[in-house]
């Protein structure tokens, strides 16, 4: 057959679906690879063809669209499973073609099993809620397009293993779950199960997400440099090791880049000739406030090094701060015998 633009295996779209549930999977060509949509392609006379390679096999085979109850079907650019089976796992390819044009992409589909508490190998999206911030909601994700608006599904919400009922500050409201005032105790996995009828059958959609309660923007402050500070002086003799920690606290800020860096005499350590190493460690509080520590280290400090200016800098979306370390050369202690001799007027 003629050449086909092969976009390969799109591993960015590792699709995971639960066993025995409906799944609708859009051909990624129109979402990520081509500049036109399915309608345009269809009206231009292009045909969308689906095939697959089952798990642990190399053989590409057509998808069987003649299964009982139309278990697998195609509708426009969507491949439907009603419902999935465990052995549907494999790499699926959608190919758009006519006599003169061909483009195709493959993507992995994994059908996973869940346990009685909705635990599974599924990668869970994380939804961050601000602590003590007033009413916040999460919405049951990825259920659009499964049933028409005329169908009224039932939705059951769970936290871990348990139906959410009579919780003080968490209220199920259909597709939404409302947190009246989010607390650390609300951290955990939340599952919505959407149940709907279709053609005399009942289908279920299970969606689990992780809720993480984080610091509120109301309480956010610019970075705070705890060290270096005015109370600590780094007094060293030439030849000793100089270690200066820069410890900075960052309030949690959604999508903020937290940065810490040192300058020596106004330059980045990489831009100067002295043998300096910097080690960084990061820790987080329960609400994802961050403490970054960068330790500046000079193994054998010289008297020149002890005259330099060492400044720790920090930046977040809330602002930028800097603090200089107090570094000085240790004055050698006077030699005792000489002083005594001088004191007695000896020559």
């Amino acid at each position: 057959s003629e050449r086909c633009d092969d976009w390969g295996l799109d591993t960015m779209r590792q699709i995971q679906v639960f066993e025995d549930e409906p799944a609708r999977i859009k051909c990624p060509l129109f979402e990520h690879f081509l500049k036109f949509n399915y309608s345009t392609a269809h009206s231009a006379g292009l045909t969308l063809i689906w095939y697959w390679t089952r798990q642990d096999r190399d053989l590409e085979e057509p998808i069987n669209f003649r299964l009982p109850e139309n278990r697998i079907s195609k509708e426009k650019d969507v491949l439907w499973f009603r419902p999935t089976l465990l052995n549907d796992t494999g790499n699926y390819t959608c190919m758009l073609r006519n006599t003169t044009y061909c483009s195709k992409v493959a993507f992995p589909l994994e059908v996973v099993q869940k346990d009685s508490c909705f635990n599974s190998p599924m990668k869970l999206p994380v939804h961050k809620l601000y602590i003590e911030y007033g009413i916040q909601r999460i919405t049951c994700p990825n259920v659009d397009g499964y049933f028409p608006s005329s169908v009224k599904p039932t939705i059951t919400w769970y936290m871990g293993c348990y139906k959410i009922q009579n919780f003080n500050n968490v209220i199920p409201e259909g597709m939404n779950l409302s947190f009246l005032i989010a607390l650390i105790s609300n951290n955990g996995n939340y599952t919505c199960v959407v149940t709907y009828p279709e053609n005399g059958r009942t289908f279920h959609l299970t969606r689990t997400l992780t809720v993480k309660v984080v610091g509120s923007p109301k309480n956010a402050v610019p970075p705070v440099i705890h060290s270096p500070n005015d109370h600590v002086v780094y007094e060293k003799e030439p030849g000793e090791e100089l270690l200066i920690p820069c410890t900075v606290y960052f309030s949690f800020l959604m999508d903020s880049r937290n940065e810490v860096w040192w300058t020596i005499d106004g330059k980045k350590p990489d831009d100067i000739t002295i043998d300096v190493t910097i080690n960084e460690s990061i820790s987080h509080s329960r609400t994802e406030d961050e403490t970054r520590t960068q330790i500046l280290s000079i193994k054998k400090v010289t008297s020149e090094d002890l005259k330099r200016s060492y400044v720790c800098h920090a930046r977040s979306a809330k602002g930028e701060v800097a603090k200089a370390a107090k570094v000085k050369q240790k004055v050698p202690a006077p030699r005792y015998t000489v002083e005594l001799a001088c004191g007695f007027g000896a020559t």
């Epitope: 025995d20 346990d115 009942t202 279920h204």
Partner: antibody, heavy 117, light 107 residues
Framework: QVQLVQSGAEVKKPGSSVKVSCKAS????????MNWVRQAPGQGLEWMGR????????HYAQKFQGRVTLTADKSTSTAYMELSSLRSEDTAVYYC??????????WGQGTLVTVSS | DIQMTQSPSSLSASVGDRVTITCQAS??????LNWYQQKPGKAPKLLIH???GLHAGVPSRFSGSGSGTDYTLTISSLEPEDVATYYC?????????FGGGTKVEIK
């Protein structure tokens, strides 16, 4: 379509045990709960317990705790309910009922267990 | 355990009548209530889940409503094939418990 086929009627002596089977087809056996409910002659429905074949998790009604054992064989998609120390008041029709969540969506045809000396 | 009280225990109505069965829980069950239909000599069948969700394939003449402790099953227009015993069941708190049943007959 979902089908639950139960084993045949049993006549048992007091003090003995009975094991009723429920063979499932038409759905993913390991992804749903299997409940067991009984109905004494002319009486209402009584929930006994349930098992999740995927991980073997079980819940039992306090009344039957220690006397009932629920098991599942994933290889044959069959659930079992064993009731021990039988007495005459255990005479009933025993049903298995499948539920993806908590409601029992589909039921077996029932198994009559008669306890008589 | 949560007690479920169903009323009436039996009723007789004419074809085409509107029939209402009520179910009261001994404590709030947050709409976690199912209704089952059991015809003589047959296994029960799920009619309604989560108070008002019609199970697939169930005729639309059946509907459910309620909240807190009080729930209702309504048959808008009784048909001869609706002769059966109807059970409510709570699934708010384990163990699941059933009402005593309501036997519906045709006059």
């Amino acid at each position: 379509q979902v089908q639950l086929v139960q084993s045949g009627a049993e006549v048992k002596k007091p003090g003995s045990s009975v094991k009723v089977s429920c063979k499932a087809s038409g759905y993913a056996f390991t992804s749903s709960w299997m409940n067991w409910v009984r109905q004494a002659p002319g009486q209402g429905l009584e929930w006994m317990g349930r098992i999740y074949p995927g991980d073997g998790n079980t819940h039992y009604a306090q009344k039957f705790q220690g006397r009932v054992t629920l098991t599942a064989d994933k290889s044959t998609s069959t659930a079992y309910m064993e009731l021990s120390s039988l007495r005459s008041e255990d005479t009933a029709v025993y049903y298995c009922g499948e539920g993806y969540l908590d409601p029992m969506d589909y039921w077996g045809q029932g198994t009559l267990v008669t306890v008589s000396s | 355990d949560i007690q479920m009280t169903q009323s009436p225990s039996s009723l007789s109505a004419s074809v085409g009548d509107r029939v209402t069965i009520t179910c009261q829980a001994s404590q709030g069950i947050n709409n976690y209530l199912n209704w089952y239909q059991q015809k003589p000599g047959k296994a029960p069948k799920l009619l309604i889940h989560y108070t008002s969700g019609l199970h697939a394939g169930v005729p639309s003449r059946f509907s459910g409503s309620g909240s807190g402790t009080d729930y209702t099953l309504t048959i808008s227009s009784l048909e001869p094939e609706d002769v059966a015993t109807y059970y409510c069941q709570q699934y708010s708190i384990l163990p699941w418990t059933f009402g005593g049943g309501t036997k519906v007959e045709i006059k």
